[in-house]
């Protein structure tokens, strides 16, 4: 008799793939543009990335550091009207893209939460949650919560409002903190909160340290659903050298939880490469004309257009990983087991019941390495086969689909491998 199938866990929409942050509409759309109507025209692009949710804004009225002139119910006219927003919501829904609205109140000011008028601001947020839930948004984000006094209790209250409306609504909180204890204290009183932080930002680009950070986090958070990113708002290139971008994409898409990216992460957008562009929100490079300030500054391989035409590009890798993440049971909600693979490497298995299983091996170092996969670290339910098929490598040159002997696995500098193998009873 065949073994009984394991019962599938309840899956919320944010469990099924990545979230994509567009914090600055104008930078995302390019000079001379930057409104909700224009964003509607970019939804097909978001669909092509197979992201499940768009984290938008803030887009509300906010006069810097002025509580009275901050209205969380009103869209800043520079971004468009409530009608434009409704139209965007409708279009996004048709494309199965959920919309999460950032309600960080004083987003243009010195302190995101107007440090002196916490209760007034908290009431404004409460009213805004109810208003925008009625308008049809799928969730909310609030950032810089380390600046919000009594953050845990406010988050619990906002979570109740959000979940009270529908279990299918999401609340994301963002913090600049990278301290695990601070992060855990924010999480412990808020069961379903998705928290983005700087926890992984000091992973130091070594396999051992990254492995230790990831496993500590997963052990500390237990069975709760995690999110994975390097910060609450910034681009991956703010933290990583270019040669590690592919590796981190592979890792973020295959860890158990929701990967969260900022616009431009999929093409390796780097503000530091573009004079005059701010770290917070550089202009999105749709094509070579997106940065007209210095003729010739942008080459085709830096742009969406150029990378879309190149199957070996970072964008193509992002699309493939996003696709795998959203359709493979083991990646959607599978168990996670990290194990030793040798110095400089981070490796783990994702598996769910009798479904296809995935092995991830990441070489963070700048020298080629032989992987010594220590299968003895793994439980019996997650044992390794002698061979696994190469689904993809972050480096060009490997023959995809070919079986690789796991005992003889060699990785190039900064290479990540995603391998698949079948369940064996």
């Amino acid at each position: 008799r065949a073994p009984r199938c394991r019962e599938l866990p309840a899956q919320k929409w944010w469990h099924t793939g990545a979230l994509y942050r567009i914090g600055d509409l104008q930078a995302f759309q390019g000079h001379g543009a930057g409104n909700l109507a224009g964003l509607k025209g970019r939804l097909d692009y978001l669909s092509s990335l197979k992201v499940k949710g768009l984290v938008l804004g803030p887009i509300h009225k906010n006069q810097k550091d002025d509580v009275a002139q901050t209205d969380l119910l009103q869209i800043d006219p520079n971004f468009g009207s409530k009608e434009d927003f409704d139209s965007l919501l409708q279009s996004a829904k048709k494309k199965s893209i959920r919309v999460i609205l950032d309600l960080t109140p004083n987003y243009r000011g010195e302190n995101s939460w107007f440090s002196t008028q916490v209760d007034t601001v908290a009431t404004k947020v409460k009213d805004a949650l109810e208003f925008w839930l009625q308008a049809g948004v799928d969730g909310f984000q609030v950032r810089d919560i380390e600046n919000l006094k009594d953050a845990s209790s406010f988050l619990a209250e906002w979570q109740n409002i959000t979940k009270g409306f529908s279990e299918d609504r999401l609340l994301i909180a963002g913090t600049n903190s990278s301290d695990l204890q601070q992060i855990l204290s924010l999480l412990e009183s808020n069961k379903d909160l998705l928290l983005t932080s700087s926890y992984l930002s000091d992973s130091g680009s070594t396999g051992e340290h990254t492995k230790s950070l990831v496993t500590q986090y997963l052990n500390a958070t237990g069975n709760r659903w995690c999110s994975w990113s390097l910060s609450q708002a910034r681009l991956l290139t703010s933290f990583l050298p270019a040669q590690l971008l592919r590796l981190y994409q592979l890792m973020l898409f295959t860890l158990p939880g929701t990967p969260v990216f900022s616009y431009g992460d999929e093409i390796g957008l780097d503000a530091a490469a573009l004079p005059g562009q701010p770290m917070e929100a550089p202009v999105m490079l749709w094509d070579e004309s997106s940065f007209p300030d210095i003729p010739g500054a942008v080459s085709a391989n830096m742009t969406v257009k150029g990378q879309s035409e190149d199957p070996g590009s970072l964008l193509s890798l992002f699309r493939r990983l996003s696709d795998q993440r959203s359709k493979e049971r083991s990646l959607l909600h599978g168990d996670f087991h990290a194990f030793s693979a040798g110095p400089g490497l981070f490796s783990y298995i994702r598996h769910w019941d009798q479904n296809e299983r995935f092995l991830v091996v990441l070489n963070f170092g700048d020298v080629g390495l032989s992987a010594g996969l220590q299968a003895s670290d793994l439980p019996a339910s997650a044992s390794l086969p002698a061979k696994a098929d190469l689904l993809l490598s972050t480096q060009p040159g490997r023959e995809e689909g070919s079986p690789l002997e796991l005992e003889r696995l060699k990785l190039e500098p900064h290479e990540g491998l995603l391998l698949r193998f079948p369940y064996a009873a």
């Epitope: 987003y107 243009r108 530091a272 005059g276 770290m279 917070e280 210095i294």
Partner: antibody, heavy 112, light 106 residues
Framework: QVQLVQSGAEVKKPGASVKVSCKAS????????MHWVRQAPGQGLEWIGN????????NYNERFKNRATMTRDTSTSTVYMELSSLRSEDTAVYFC?????WGQGTLVTVSS | EIVLTQSPATLSLSPGERATLACSVS?????IHWVQQKPGQAPRLWIY???KLASGVPARFSGSGSGTDFTLTISSLEPEDFAVYYC?????????FGQGTKLEIK
Amino acid sequence: QVQLVQSGAEVKKPGASVKVSCKASGYTFTSYWMHWVRQAPGQGLEWIGNINPNGGKTNYNERFKNRATMTRDTSTSTVYMELSSLRSEDTAVYFCTREIDWGQGTLVTVSS
Amino acid sequence: EIVLTQSPATLSLSPGERATLACSVSSSVNYIHWVQQKPGQAPRLWIYSTSKLASGVPARFSGSGSGTDFTLTISSLEPEDFAVYYCQQRSSYPYTFGQGTKLEIK
């Protein structure tokens, strides 16, 4: 073409404040952050901070955080940098820059 | 903050010679920029994104490097090249400059 035109030289007493202006033309003012950089006599360049003309968000170098204030007036495409509690070490040429283009500089002399 | 250290502080060379200016960064960055400044003038963006020449910069200039070590090279010095060159990082706040290398005529 792009021009950043700064206000004229200033002489101030220690403890006073100074407000330097930078009028931009030749590009869309709200599309580019403006930075302030200073250079003491015979010294190198020091970044003070930046401002997003679209909304007024600012970042400051910690060294100047409590003394520098950057503002903007979108109606005149002008950014301002005010430095308070001046001391003799603040004697310098202050530049506004869009990074691609620089203003001509404003000499601020602090002397009793 | 990220500290940039330039060497040498002063480089004395004759026109026609090759100049190599170094910039060492205290922690790894993806790109640096170089600005040129002549006496009594505002600085000018000279090389950006490590190796790209700003508008109007002659092809005898080149930039290279990655991580923590970057170089500006002038293949054959012309009289107008003598100036102070600063490297700058804009990968994290606060943006910082090196202390400058003064390129002077020997």
